[in-house]
Amino acid sequence: LNTTVLQGMAGQSLRVSCTYDALKHWGRRKAWCRQLGEEGPCQRVVSTHGVWLLAFLKKRNGSTVIADDTLAGTVTITLKNLQAGDAGLYQCQSLRGREAEVLQKVLVEVLEDPLDDQDAGDLWVPEESSSFEGAQVEHSTSRNQETSFPPTS
């Protein structure tokens, strides 16, 4: 698997979208983990709802939020209030029992905001992403901007 490099501004939010084959991964929970070293274990940061049918509901651990659109085959991870310490190598995983299949490897880089508190705009396009199981990023231009997921009526 290729590693996708994503950059985000310190203090802002970074949104990672890992796509996958919805049929192949039917019924499987997803997880976001941080890799400890080049060949080290991947330490779980957050995983989707314990009930697969409710996987689209946001689950949070600290400043990291995950939600999974299981029908579309997209798991979205949001790293809020990005800090220098958040930089590193991560994985999107699909869980099957005790096994974890890597959907995408993501290298997160944190940039110091040269504009301080001003809006930075959309700065980044992924360097590389494979044709199907890729990752994308949306760079939040507002510090508290967040898409509601799911939409409430």
């Epitope: 709802h49 314990g50 049918l53 409710l54 659109d69 799911p150 939409p151 009526s153």
Partner: antibody, heavy 126, light 106 residues
């Protein structure tokens, strides 16, 4: 009128089986998750399990105490949800309700149950 | 499993009184909480979903608030038809209900 009607309850001996039905009308059955709940006499509400909408291909989830004994299924052509209860125990004695999951959109719903049936009594006793 | 502690278990209030029921989760459940009303011999009725959203057709005297572990359900002006048992229900981890609060008129 949006309505759910349960049927199939009754007196059954421990270890035996029973199938409850929940007939839906007044809404597009395939679009909603359906759930079963129960309430033992004089007690509170307990979730039994639910089944996803047609989009989720009949995927089910159950509470731990009934897993392996109870099975939820649905028949879209008849707009009926079923609760198949096997190896019944005396502690399964309760009023059983079916309920409809509240829908946000094609993909999203919330396990807030906005339409309920009147309930059917299941008594497990020798 | 997440435990939902509802209090009080019962209360008696006068018509027109403000009634408050609390529900405490054993761990953070975000806003994944609903409130139901159940009258004797009847099925439950959804009043509030996602902690604070009023279900369509439910009178505005009913409201809900809270997030994390502490949630509140309020009837701003108790009416005779509000006599019932009220339940909270979480869905952050599977589905569990609080023990219920029986509301009576003084």
């Amino acid at each position: 009128e949006v309505q759910l009607v349960e049927s199939g309850g009754g007196l059954v001996q421990p270890g035996r089986s029973l199938r409850l039905s929940c007939t839906a009308s007044g809404f597009t059955f395939d679009d909603h998750a359906m759930s079963w709940f129960r309430q033992a006499p004089g007690k509170g509400l307990e979730w039994v399990g639910f089944i996803g909408s047609k989009a989720y291909g009949g995927t089910t989830e159950y509470t731990a105490s009934v897993k392996g004994r109870f099975t939820i299924s649905r028949d879209g052509s008849k707009s009926i949800a079923y609760l198949q209860m096997n190896s019944l125990k005396t502690e399964d004695t309760a009023v059983y309700y079916c309920a409809r999951g509240k829908r946000y959109s094609y993909t999203y719903w919330t396990p807030a149950f906005d339409v309920w049936g009147q309930g059917t009594m299941v008594t497990v006793s020798s | 499993d997440i435990q939902m502690t509802q209090s009080p278990s019962s209360l008696s209030a006068s018509v027109g009184d403000r009634v408050t029921i609390t529900c405490q989760a054993s761990q953070d459940i975000t806003n994944y909480l609903n409130w139901y009303q159940q009258k004797p011999g009847k099925a439950p009725k959804l009043l509030i979903y996602d902690a604070s959203n009023l279900e369509t057709g439910v009178p505005s005297r009913f409201s809900g608030s809270g997030s994390g572990t502490d949630f509140t359900f309020t009837i701003s002006s108790l009416q005779p038809e509000d006599i019932a048992t009220y339940y909270c229900q979480q869905y952050d981890s599977y589905l569990t209900f609080g023990g219920g609060t029986k509301v009576e008129i003084k």
